[in-house]
């Protein structure tokens, strides 16, 4: 509009300002290292810090480091964010017994409950699991290793393995200390309760399926063991993991004995289109960061799409010209970055681990 | 913990509009961006359109032209005004904060808010 021109050439001519054409306003320019929290700021008031990745802003302000979920007894609960930590919890099958801010200091495996005893609440991540006195008729399970044996019929007791508790069992007294195997082991000890059936009525040819052994005396140890690469789902099943050799993706977390590996797109990229664990279509994110070197104030209310790079590689953020246009070239499509075969069976089922890469292989 | 609640959702015939809104709750809603993914019965969850703090957007190429982003920090909501309507639009629509950090894996749909179901019939 002509009638903006003075204004324009004006507020163009404060270094600490910028003129935004979308709104035809003058605005400002936050400081370098601080990011706009709306559209045309007015003063400093409304620019704030830009943290370092796996940090966020607390509420006083600082940068402040997310907790760390890497412990093998741990889990992300809830990602690290612009604003607040990540939050972690026990895996599953263990649940927390010295709680602290967003995390837990020890993890304990769920308990089982002994012969005679049933579940009345099962674990969770935060609490053991409690045990009752079976109601008369039921057997106990277990107690011996007859009573231990593949059901004949397609009947399921129980239909999915539940932890269980008292503190008569050394679970309780029992902290993760080594790495995944030990994880691994100690779980298969204490993960199915009595009176479940060793392999949920499936024969022990399954893929994925180590030959599983009667319990041994007086125990619970009727959990069936997958082959490495295949966990135990829900129903039971030995179900393959997720595979993340695909180059735009990184593993977020281990395949484990009761639940697959999850994989996510690598640093840089979005995930656009979903699958089971993992992500079908990874594409470079597509909206520059503030401290690129862009100038994003300029770009106010332009479509920042982008022309697909490499795989691995950022969108072009290279400064846009003084008038606030976008460069001609920018004109992309996030269908078109990766190959568009990726996705079209999708959802993709957790037993059959994509493998597709970006580069056709 | 973060809390998104969309709403605006409903059943529309083709060619018709619908504004949604995603407000949030526990959290200030000026962090660097947000998204909105949708997911259709039986199918993946996917990207539908990003904006930043500063206003810049982004759109998937199937809603370019027909469904704007906009951003309300000082009610803590983003809206998508979604036109012309077509059928293969119909899904669950669900915003998602700060998606550079907290969408790289398959889990954008459904994991800060129950998301608003649009439904268009021909």
């Known amino acids: 509009f002509p009638q903006d021109r003075p204004f324009e050439d004006t507020c163009r001519g404060n270094p600490g300002h910028y003129y935004d054409k979308a709104v035809r306003r003058c605005c400002y320019r936050c400081p370098t290292g601080l990011f706009p929290t709306q559209q045309c700021p007015q003063r400093p008031a409304d620019c704030r810090k830009q943290c370092e990745p796996d940090y966020y802003l607390d509420e006083a302000g600082r940068c402040t480091a997310c907790v760390s979920c890497s412990r093998d007894d741990l889990v992300e609960k809830m990602p690290c964010a612009w604003n607040s930590s990540r939050v972690c919890e026990c895996q599953p099958g263990m649940f927390c017994a010295v709680s602290v801010v967003n995390s837990c200091a020890r993890c304990f495996f769920h308990s089982v409950c002994p012969a005679g005893m049933i579940v009345k609440f099962p674990g969770t991540a935060q609490k053991n699991t409690v045990c009752e006195p079976a109601s008369p008729g039921v057997s106990p399970a277990c107690a011996s290793p007859e009573n231990c044996k593949e059901p004949s019929s397609g009947t399921i007791p129980q239909a999915k393995p539940t932890p269980v508790s008292p503190a008569t069992s050394n679970a309780s007294t029992m902290p993760l200390r080594g790495g995944t195997r030990l994880a691994q082991e100690a779980a298969s000890k204490l993960t199915r309760a009595p009176g479940s059936p060793s392999s949920v009525g499936r024969p022990s040819s399954d893929p994925g399926l180590s030959p599983t052994q009667p319990c041994p005396q007086g125990s619970g140890d009727c959990r069936k063991q997958c082959e490495p690469d295949y966990y135990l789902d829900e129903a039971g099943r030995c179900t393959a993991c997720v595979s993340c050799s695909r180059d735009d993706l990184v593993e977020k977390t281990p395949c484990a004995w009761n639940s697959s590996r999850i994989c996510e797109c690598r640093p840089g990229m979005i995930c656009a289109t979903s699958a089971t664990n993992s992500c079908a279509r990874c594409v470079p994110y597509p909206i520059c960061a503030a401290e690129t070197g862009t100038k994003p104030q300029d770009m106010a209310e332009k479509d920042t799409t982008f022309e697909a790079p490499p795989v691995g590689t950022q969108p072009d953020c290279s400064p846009t010209p003084e008038n606030g246009e976008a460069p001609a070239s920018t004109s992309p499509t996030l269908s078109s970055l990766v190959d568009s075969q990726a996705s079209k069976t999708l959802p993709i089922p957790t037993s059959a681990p994509i493998a597709l890469s970006s580069t056709g292989k | 913990e973060v809390q998104l609640v969309e709403s605006g959702g409903g059943s529309v015939q083709a060619g018709g509009s619908l504004r949604l809104s995603c407000t949030a709750s526990?959290?200030?809603?000026?962090?660097?961006?947000m998204a909105w993914y949708r997911q259709a019965p039986g199918n993946a969850c996917e990207l539908v359109s990003i904006?930043?703090?500063?206003?810049?957007?982004y759109y998937t190429d199937s809603v370019k032209g027909r469904f704007t982003i906009s951003r309300d920090n000082a009610k803590n909501t983003v809206f998508l005004y979604l036109n012309s309507l077509q059928p293969e639009d119909t899904a669950v629509y669900y915003c998602?904060?700060?998606?550079?950090?907290?969408?790289?894996?398959?889990?954008?749909?459904?994991?800060w808010g129950p998301g608003t179901q649009v439904t268009v019939s021909s």
């Open positions: 998602a904060p700060d998606p550079r950090r907290n969408c790289r894996g398959g889990y954008c749909c459904g994991n």
């Open positions: 526990r959290f200030t809603f000026d962090g660097p961006d």
């Open positions: 904006i930043s703090a500063d206003g810049r957007t």
